[in-house]
Interface confidence: low
């Protein structure tokens, strides 16, 4: 015997209150597939989350952080702080990379400069806290008077870049 | 000095109901994310559910979505877990946890590691 409650479309629930009638989801709640028993009740962004997509009768809203952070989790779950390029996010704030690292990003941590010299290659252009080391063409392959490259200007040092 | 410390653990029949709370000290605890974390017997630690420094923000494991309610009264410094239709599984000891919340306002986290204070549990038991 087929299940009445089968024929309620998304939407809807099967109100076993009203002889297993598809009534509408009430406000604030949704169901996603047919023959539900009851609507799930809508996710709420509030605080540091905003709302991306507003919950409907057949699907969930959707959120998203407000400017200054950003997603963490399955479906945005938590919000976490953005920095500034050439920083990382510590238990205690944001935090300038240390010299040898970089961070291109608002988010993640910061990254050890590449060693050049693992390629056998020079240093083309020094690192910074906010980009990488950019490697050139090995000593051996710049041959007097064939190189147009400018000497690389001094590392920074940690802890002096403008904030 | 800082102190976390849990109340309200117990001996509860399937189905039924506990509020635990956690009564925080020696820090500005509007300031301070905070979580439940639970150990069952011979089992890791689980991360039940955490809130931000000001409410606006939760978190529930899914395990726990939808019969447990974190709350917390930053007049009263004190964080709660509602545990409601209570399972045998639900059975272990309740951690309460805090940790600063560079993510303030709307902050919290789920890793363990975030989490500076810990208070000395309360045991939760689920058995008919």
């Known amino acids: 015997l087929q299940d009445p409650c089968s024929n309620c479309p998304a939407g809807t629930f099967c109100d076993n209150n009203r002889n297993q009638i598809c009534s509408p989801c009430p406000p604030n709640s949704f169901s996603s597939a047919g023959g539900q028993r009851t609507c799930d009740i809508c996710r709420q962004c509030k605080g540091v989350f905003r709302t991306r997509k507003e919950c409907s009768s057949t699907s969930n809203a959707e959120c998203d952080c407000t400017p200054g952070f950003h997603c963490l989790g399955a479906g945005c779950s938590m919000c976490e702080q953005d920095c500034k390029q050439g920083q990382e996010l510590t238990k205690k704030g944001c935090k300038d990379c240390c010299f040898g690292t970089f961070n291109d990003q608002k988010r993640g941590i910061c990254r050890p400069w590449t060693n050049c010299s693992l390629d056998g290659k020079s240093v083309l252009v020094n690192g910074t806290k906010e980009r990488d080391v950019v490697c050139g063409p090995s000593p051996a392959d710049l041959s007097p008077g064939a190189s147009s490259v400018t000497p690389p200007a001094p590392a920074r040092e940690p802890g002096h870049s403008p904030q | 000095e800082v102190q976390l410390v849990e109340s309200g653990g117990g001996l509860v029949q399937p189905g039924g109901s506990l509020r635990l709370s956690c009564a925080a000290s020696?820090?500005?605890?509007?300031?301070?994310?905070m979580g439940w974390v639970r150990q069952a017997p011979g089992k890791g630690r689980e991360f039940v559910s955490a809130?931000?420094?000001?409410?606006?923000?939760?978190y529930y494991a899914d395990s726990v979505k939808g019969r447990f309610t974190i709350s917390r009264d930053n007049s009263k410094n004190t964080l709660y877990l509602q545990m409601n239709s209570l399972r045998a599984e639900d059975t272990a000891v309740y951690y309460c946890?805090?940790?600063?919340?560079?993510?303030?306002?709307?902050?919290?986290?789920?890793?363990?590691?975030?989490?500076?204070?810990w208070g000395q549990g309360t045991q939760v038991t689920v058995s008919s």
């Open positions: 946890a805090a940790g600063y919340s560079y993510l303030y306002p709307g902050g919290l986290s789920t890793r363990p590691s975030f989490y500076d204070y």
């Open positions: 020696g820090f500005t605890f509007s300031s301070y994310a």
């Open positions: 809130i931000s420094g000001n409410g606006g923000s939760t």
